[in-house]
């Protein structure tokens, strides 16, 4: 999916009224120090296509963060404020029903909602410069 | 079973402002969002605007932004929709309709409409 | 804005009769078109969503294709119960739209 048309502002006011504070409370009890961050994005559409990816797919020793909250309202702000893209779901929505798993909060987990959060932060403060 | 029940027929004097209700019941409120559309006599369907009360907020079409307002009372699991300045042509039937939002994407229960009538 | 526009505006049509009716979009929509029926005192019944998946309850006779710009509803074999306004709809972009209505009357 190219995310090159999506409404970004109205994405950013979900993140900052919302869904970063579900990233803070999955977060609580972990040092943000705990984790660096190895997952960048350079553009707006760049960032949504890496959170979408770090947040709908599971990866090896994190196969759970699709149901939690944050996800859901990712979700929904993606399938909201992106042209066409609830289209894309229709399928996956379906697919996922099938492989649905016990929510299960492992480190893996926890490290890729702190690159997560990189992303989002990186997302809201598109004119900076990559470092 | 999904049900979409809003409140009964308006009349109103133009210049004033009404509100629609639309008390859902049988599916999880914060699952789906709430849009408006309405309907004037003998015309086709207009899309007002949606509640999302999963990321509590609004959003509307420009047609009718300043002048409609979009909530909801996740509580009692009731949406909203006011409309202000009303003017003749704003008689019709609004319509509240439910859409998922992290699945289905798409207007699948609708309420039974509430005729508002614009008139001096 | 997108713009849908249906059409015929009315097709009469005789009980068993096949209908056929066409919307088409003022932009590139993918599959992101969903189909109404409306009777007269009634609210929009969905028929079809994201132009081609059918809803559970709604008669197999109810199909629908296409994408891109073009889409069609077909009802094979028309019931009676059927003869109803249909509406098109957009959920691509905000905001949505829909389409004039196609009349499906008695012949």
């Known amino acids: 999916y190219d995310f090159t048309n999506c409404d970004f502002e109205k994405i950013k006011a979900a993140y900052l009224s919302t869904i970063s504070k579900d990233l803070i409370t999955y977060m609580s009890g972990t040092k943000s120090t705990e984790f660096n961050n190895t997952v960048s994005c350079s553009n707006r559409p760049h960032c949504l296509t890496e959170i979408q990816s770090l947040t709908f797919n599971p990866t090896a020793g994190c196969a759970s963060l699709a149901k939690e909250m944050f996800a859901m309202k990712t979700k929904a702000a993606l399938a909201i404020w992106c042209p066409g893209y609830s289209e894309t779901q229709i399928n996956a929505t379906q697919a996922m029903k099938k492989r649905r798993k016990r929510k299960v909060t492992t480190n893996k987990c926890l490290e890729q909602v702190s690159q997560l959060q990189g992303l989002w932060r990186r997302f809201n403060r598109p004119l900076l410069k990559q470092q | 079973q999904v049900q979409l029940v809003q409140s009964g027929p308006e009349v109103k004097k133009p210049g004033s402002s009404v509100k629609v209700s639309c008390k859902a019941s049988?599916?999880?409120?914060?699952?789906?969002?709430m849009h408006w559309v309405r309907q004037r006599p003998g015309q086709d369907l207009e899309w007002m605007g949606t509640?999302?009360?999963?990321?509590?907020?609004?959003d509307y079409n420009q047609n009718f932004k300043g002048r409609a307002t979009i909530t909801a009372d996740k509580s009692t699991s009731t949406a909203y929709m006011e409309l202000s300045s009303l003017r003749s042509e704003d008689t019709a039937v609004y319509y509240c309709?439910?859409?998922?939002?992290?699945?289905?994407?798409?207007?699948?229960?609708w309420g039974q409409g509430t005729l508002v009538t614009v008139s001096s | 804005e997108i713009v849908l526009t249906q059409s015929p505006g009315t097709l009469s049509l005789s009980p068993g009769e096949r209908a056929t009716l066409s919307c088409r979009a003022s932009?590139?929509?993918?599959?992101?078109v969903h189909w109404y029926q409306q009777k007269p005192g009634e609210a929009p019944r969905l028929l079809i969503y994201?132009?081609?998946q059918s809803i559970s309850g709604i008669p197999d006779r109810f199909s629908g294709s296409g994408s891109g710009t073009d889409f069609t509803l077909t009802i094979s074999r028309l019931e009676s119960e059927d003869f109803a306004v249909y509406y098109c709809?957009?959920?691509?972009?905000?905001?949505?739209?829909f389409g004039r209505g196609t009349k499906v009357e008695i012949k």
């Open positions: 309709a439910r859409m998922g939002v992290t699945h289905s994407y798409v207007m699948d229960a």
């Open positions: 049988g599916y999880i409120f914060t699952d789906y969002a």
């Open positions: 994201f132009a081609s």
């Open positions: 509640f999302i009360p999963l990321l509590d907020t609004s």
């Open positions: 932009q590139h929509i993918s599959r992101s």
């Open positions: 709809q957009q959920s691509y972009s905000f905001p949505y739209t």
